[in-house]
């Protein structure tokens, strides 16, 4: 079949990084600059993807891959491709439309990204708070508090915390 | 909130250089990941898009307009100007300067209300 | 340049309606495709961004599909503040090029 298709149509001949080109005589021509086919048989080479402003070259344009973009320092990639760069926050903040804000008492977030979750409750697994959440750090939960030996306290568990996706205001 | 305001003459003749002030708040041009753009748009057609410029003073330009486009940036002053040499009667448009989408690129999320130039002898 | 182009240019349309208005690239432009609505006299103002990000304070009418060549506008239940012109803009690669619009028109 392959045979038979580049017999019939030259333009199959003309592999990933070239062009069929009809201006001149369907010979294979190289992709211009910033330009780039990725697979053979193409009529035209699609336009490289450029990475500028908030976005840097990850990977750069050849004749046969586009290029690939992520985010300058202090943005991450959000979206397919990463189609969008989200600035980064402090662990122990969220991102909200006015910028990085601290969690609210009884939740956290360990990365420089995403939304600050409520700490676990230890009590829902009839267990006891060993450590104590900060914005940065969820709980420790320890033994129930039926295991600990006579006398021994444990620290108390924490407020029922917010709803998750609930930015401070 | 963010808001912008051309500013500029509403008529100039051909081969003039017209000069158009983009005067904003609400944001610093001087903040990683701003930038702002010029769109125009002739009476009764699509938009078209002119230059940018990003807070770390990156331009880029319309191919086809290139040699004719300068685009500046005050930061203290709130302010990007644009200027465009040799105007012809085809360059008759509303010129919008617009705020990019914080984090995407050519993204215009926040317009002006636009400026009325019209090239007639 | 990537070329877009929009269909139908325009198109009338009753309030309550569902209306599509499509939007195709001259190449693959991932999901680097934004959508504005324009009145006359009016700027732009954008609504669906990354081919299907609502825009903050657009209604929920609104939404956007699509990635590669074929994007698509559905306004799920065309209201009386809907009637304008929309246009599809890539933001792929350097110059942003927007479709030559679609006039939504009272039937």
């Known amino acids: 079949f392959e045979r038979t298709r580049s017999l019939q149509d030259p333009c199959s001949n003309c592999p990933a990084g070239t062009f069929c080109d009809n201006n001149r005589n369907q010979i294979c021509s190289p992709c211009p600059p910033n330009s780039f086919s990725s697979a053979g048989g193409q009529r035209t080479c699609d336009i490289c993807r450029q990475c500028k402003g908030v976005f840097r070259t990850r990977k750069e344009c050849s004749s046969t891959s586009n290029a690939e973009c992520d985010c300058t320092p202090g943005f991450h990639c959000l979206g397919a491709g990463c189609s969008m760069c989200e600035q980064d926050c402090k662990q122990g903040q969220e991102l909200t439309k006015k910028g990085c804000k601290d969690c609210c008492f009884g939740t956290f977030n360990d990365q420089k990204r995403g939304i600050c979750r409520p700490w676990t409750n230890c009590s829902l697994d009839g267990k006891s708070v060993l450590v104590n959440g900060t914005k940065e750090r969820d709980v420790v939960c320890g033994p129930s508090p039926a295991d600990l030996s006579p006398g021994a306290s444990s620290v108390t568990p924490p407020a029922p915390a917010r709803e998750p996706g609930h930015s401070p205001q | 909130q963010i808001t912008l305001k051309e500013s500029g003459p509403t008529l100039v003749k051909p081969t003039q250089t017209l000069t158009l002030s983009c005067t904003f708040s609400?944001?610093?041009?001087?903040?990683?990941?701003?930038?702002v753009g010029w769109i125009r748009q002739p009476p009764g057609k699509a938009l078209e898009w002119l230059a940018l410029i990003y807070w770390n003073d990156d331009k880029y330009f319309s191919p086809s307009l290139k040699s004719r486009l300068t685009i500046t940036k005050d930061t203290s002053k709130n302010q990007v100007v644009l200027t465009l040499t040799n105007m012809d009667p085809v360059d008759t448009a509303t010129y919008y300067c617009?705020?990019?989408?914080?984090?995407?690129?050519?993204?215009?999320?926040?317009w002006g209300q636009g400026t009325m130039v019209t090239v007639s002898s | 340049d990537i070329q877009m182009t929009q269909s139908p240019s325009s198109l009338s349309a009753s309030v309550g309606d569902r209306v599509t208005i499509t939007c195709r690239a001259s190449?693959?432009?991932?999901?680097?495709l934004n959508w504005y609505q324009q009145k006359p006299g009016k700027a732009p103002k954008l609504l669906i961004y990354?081919?299907?990000s609502l825009q903050s304070g657009v209604p929920s009418r609104f939404s956007g599909s699509g990635s590669g060549t074929d994007f698509t506008l559905t306004i799920s239940s065309l209201q009386p503040e809907d009637f304008a012109t929309y246009y599809c803009q890539q933001s792929y690669s350097t110059p942003p090029t927007f479709g030559q619009g679609t006039k939504v028109e009272i039937k």
């Open positions: 190449q693959s432009i991932s999901s680097y």
């Open positions: 609400g944001f610093s041009l001087s903040t990683s990941g701003m930038s």
């Open positions: 617009a705020h990019t989408l914080w984090g995407s690129d050519d993204v215009f999320d926040v």
């Open positions: 990354a081919a299907s």
